[in-house]
Amino acid sequence: IAPSRPWALMEQYEVVLPWRLPGPRVRRALPSHLGLHPERVSYVLGATGHNFTLHLRKNRDLLGSGYTETYTAANGSEVTEQPRGQDHCFYQGHVEGYPDSAASLSTCAGLRGFFQVGSDLHLIEPLDEGGEGGRHAVYQAEHLLQTAGTCGVSDDSLGSLLGPRTAAVFRPRPGDSLPSRETRYVELYVVVDNAEFQMLGSEAAVRHRVLEVVNHVDKLYQKLNFRVVLVGLEIWNSQDRFHVSPDPSVTLENLLTWQARQRTRRHLHDNVQLITGVDFTGTTVGFARVSAMCSHSSGAVNQDHSKNPVGVACTMAHEMGHNLGMDHDENVQGCRCQERFEAGRCIMAGSIGSSFPRMFSDCSQAYLESFLERPQSVCLANAPDLSHLVGGPVCGNLFVERGEQCDCGPPEDCRNRCCNSTTCQLAEGAQCAHGTCCQECKVKPAGELCRPKKDMCDLEEFCDGRHPECPEDAFQENGTPCSGGYCYNGACPTLAQQCQAFWGPGGQAAEESCFSYDILPGCKASRYRADMCGVLQCKGGQQPLGRAICIVDVCHALTTEDGTAYEPVPEGTRCGPEKVCWKGRCQDLHVYRSSNCSAQCHNHGVCNHKQECHCHAGWAPPHCAKLLTEVHAASGSLP
């Protein structure tokens, strides 16, 4: 797999010396979570008569939250570790000036991987030990000397699982946008057999190759709005745990039987993929169980058939496609592969031929969407917890996440000079980058209005001189009179307002008599009640869409389809003078107040809806007894 003269395996290649573009200046003390490899990096490659500029971003979602590695220790015992501080050197990105381009590379020891421009797939790998600036070979997949590989999944095994194959099903989506649905996640467990381990020579080499492969697979699936996240890697560095046969169907059966036995003590995952160094019989390089994703049979076997890891990545993407319900393209009448190059094939072609595919056909996408409608696909919906992802959150997504000081979007979008868009850290000398109380990269002085009062139940908020964010929105004390009612958590709930909210502008509160009884399931009037805090009763307006109603005389109540539950009068609604609905009963306003809260605010604030002092501009919480400037001076801290 890694011979001493890699170029001996290429028919034609071009020698390039990649040039790394200088990144934006960053603060000298980079946070430790940024690791040794930068968050983003760009390279210029002169190849095929063009200067290609590759913009790459570290794939921070490559490894799942509880990522584990399992191997055999020197004493023969099986060891499972959760590696700490998992910095890595696997990147994804695009080529500048080519809208539909893609790139997936590792930068660990020189550049290795692929970049796609239009219909051309370029592979790159180092020719010597010169690192990222040294000599590299850039070549097209068809110039890699290898035999064509086929998938062992037969038409017979597909037929009953996939249903009729007609051209009419496959309507191409307009443009090349992602499918309009939730991003799905495949939590992947990879097993590497002993033959592959022997071929690569060390755990480190295996780990590097597997991460490279999964990075490529993830990039291929992103076009389908999928992410492939590695949650576990098992390396059989001592001996195989089951017989890996040259017959791929036998090996798959053995893998799935072994996996079923291991499931209780191994990582929970959606899919298992074996990478083997065993040469499968004939031209077969992969075999999978069709439509098995999320089941106990969710898995496939892949022969590492090519010197370049992109080869086994394409095989894995293909076999995982079968797990996701996809058929071979050539089995589907009217199937369109939008590859434009000569003999271009898509990922689900039965044979990969001499060039690696880089996209899914229209029919693969249709099969996938169909599979996702099945209840079994639910395991793909759970998004990884970003706060736990090894490698951390995503810089450039407009969310300030763990370890980030700011996030102004991708570099192409960011116009915020206070934030370094490449690292999501504050620019040199900046105190802040976002927030209503941040101006010109500095925190605004205490007392500046940052959120005006929006109605009679609201309170205005002021900057505190220390934080770039406006303080949390606070409201008038519950029970403060407002138009026709009493303030409650910032709202002014009245029966009339509630009826309008559901029934539209013509909605009104029903007659008082409508509120004098409760309703039992099945729209039956029941026992008398003495207040207006039961079921919300309205008249007039338009019946809300998708809601069932219960009509008794002129009283209209909203109910569930089965008539067992009713829309209640909300908490805080006025039910009489100085009275509000509270816990289903009409009670005195004093239920809101445990004490005279405002007396604690030293005449420099009022009580809010949380029974806390809300200070006037420039005064410090909690009791508005001191000026903010005095408090800051005493603590001696900068914002």
């Epitope: 971003r57 946008s177 992602l178 499918p179 991003t183 998004a383 997504n397 996030d407 979007g409 976002h434």
Partner: nanobody, 124 residues
Framework: EVQLVESGGGLVQAGGSLRLSCAAS????????MGWFRQAPGKEREFVAA?????LYADSVEGRFTISRDNDQNTVYLQMSSLKPEDTAAYFC????????????????????WGQGTQVTVSS
Amino acid sequence: EVQLVESGGGLVQAGGSLRLSCAASGRTFSNYVMGWFRQAPGKEREFVAAMGDTTLYADSVEGRFTISRDNDQNTVYLQMSSLKPEDTAAYFCAARSRFIPPLTFRTGGAYDYWGQGTQVTVSS
């Protein structure tokens, strides 16, 4: 599947204000970058603003429009002030998963879900 429903459009005089709302349902709202786009008759769809925790604006609306969101209410807002006749357009709300950042949030192709739109007409 995320459903987006815009409201709040209407006819307003130049210099006036309007507040658009976009109610989202179906998925965890806080996992989405929310965007506003607009399209005037016979013109290309144009980026207006986007928001995660932080915000982006088109140069043409910076200082006049404010995007905000309420994760508890699953709603994103576009407060439009100092409106001009050239702001007349159909306004669309869009959502994009936060887990795969695009190259830019300023193009429609970056977003996974779209609302049906609400019309804003600014008269002179």
